[in-house]
Amino acid sequence: FVRTKIDTTENLLNTEVHSSPAQRWSMQVPPEVSAEAGDAAVLPCTFTHPHRHYDGPLTAIWRAGEPYAGPQVFRCAAARGSELCQTALSLHGRFRLLGNPRRNDLSLRVERLALADDRRYFCRVEFAGDVHDRYESRHGVRLHVTAAPRIVNISVLPSPAHAFRALCTAEGEPPPALAWSGPALGNSLAAVRSPREGHGHLVTAELPALTHDGRYTCTAANSLGRSEASVYLFRFHGASGAST
């Protein structure tokens, strides 16, 4: 598949030179689509173009992150006179065209959503053959993936002066609130770190000093649910044993 880099022509495509106002290039996408992790989501995208009876070869493309330059997650091509768009790329096999590009519909279905899919997506169509033309959505559609909390790591680590500290990291969207409970603790929010740069769905809470042996439980909760995990601290001659 030849991908042209001359996308500067997009501005020309919106001018009177190309077509009457009723048949300009345009793309219609919603600002945002929300879905839960593990489910499927549909990213709607329809378009208008000035070549009303175009029957030549076409390519439909979806990319993630940024328009024009972001990585492609889906691509299909339809031959002249065909309504069958043959998939050439579907990242991890999770992207499937729902719409019919011949009928101005590039809507995409994303299966088995993960929090990592939470980003902006951009649809694009390219005509080849008699007509060489292309258009891509500038603003795209934001896929907002929500998820119940999941504790991804819980551990006990040594700290200075023969003490121990506990770390709990959880992911979820909205980012979960974390709380520790354990011997002589009651319920403690402990030191909760803000979501880390580039890891917007991860939250970490630290118990800086574990003073008693026993079971320490981390609970993560958001509007979609809660999750908990425990570690055990046993001190034998200055050593620790931890299990979850």
């Epitope: 329809t46 031959a79 309504e83």
Partner: antibody, heavy 116, light 112 residues
């Protein structure tokens, strides 16, 4: 030139199954849907469904779900339709059609006769 | 399902004259993209159907320009000018806007 060549006439017993074929030539088989159409003797045309060879795209007329099963073999550029639990109502000529706009070329038809 | 109706079961015509065959749909076949998803087919006696017109008014490859299609969203006409003996057979309209695709009952063109 584009051609769709269908398998020969079939005489089958009630309750049995039959599989008819449609071999395409003269174009890239995987680029176009293959449609299947039923025509009972002296009657009109009825769309059964269509398959996109080499893709997961299969569409059925609800009326024929459970009756017709569409498959395709890319390596031989052949589409197949299996008809199951046959009754006298299934006695008909079955056509495949493909290429531009889905219906630009038609096979010569396969006559299926269901009779005890 | 969209119902396609061809009211006239048969239309007699004299060779050299013009004739119109009509078809109606229970729902508009005009898509938001401006195209009208209607086909016209001719099935000559003992033969397979042949595509004449696609998207209501576009002549299929190899079809003589004596054939023409027109219409609105729900009412369609196939016009044949200078009818020839080889034009006899059944003419079917078909919608492919929505699944399942549906055909009209057919109109038989016969020579007077």
């Amino acid at each position: 030139q584009v051609q769709l060549k269908q398998s020969g006439a079939e005489l089958v017993k009630p309750g049995a199954s039959v599989k008819i074929s449609c071999k395409a030539s003269g174009y890239i088989f995987t680029d176009y849907y293959v449609n299947w159409v039923k025509q009972r003797p002296g009657q009109g045309l009825e769309w059964i469904g269509k398959i996109g060879p080499g893709s997961v795209s299969i569409y059925y007329n609800e009326k024929f779900k459970g009756k017709a099963t569409l498959t395709a073999d890319k390596s031989s550029s052949t589409a197949y339709m299996q008809l199951s639990s046959l009754t006298s109502e299934d006695s008909a000529v079955y056509f495949c059609a493909s290429y531009y706009y889905g219906f630009a070329y038609w096979g010569q038809g396969t006559l299926v006769t269901v009779s005890a | 399902d969209i119902v396609m109706t061809q009211a006239a079961p048969s239309v007699p015509v004299t060779p050299g004259e013009s004739v119109s065959i009509s078809c109606r749909s229970s729902k508009s076949l005009l898509h938001s993209n401006g195209n009208t998803y209607l086909y016209w087919f001719l099935q000559r006696p003992g033969q397979s159907p042949q595509l004449l017109i696609y998207r209501m008014s576009n002549l299929a490859s190899g079809v003589p320009d004596r054939f023409g299609g027109s219409g609105s969203g729900t009412a369609f006409t196939l016009r044949i000018s200078r009818v020839e003996a080889e034009d006899v057979g059944f003419y079917y309209c078909m919608q492919h806007l929505e699944y399942p695709y549906t055909f009209g009952g057919g109109t038989r063109l016969e020579i007077k």
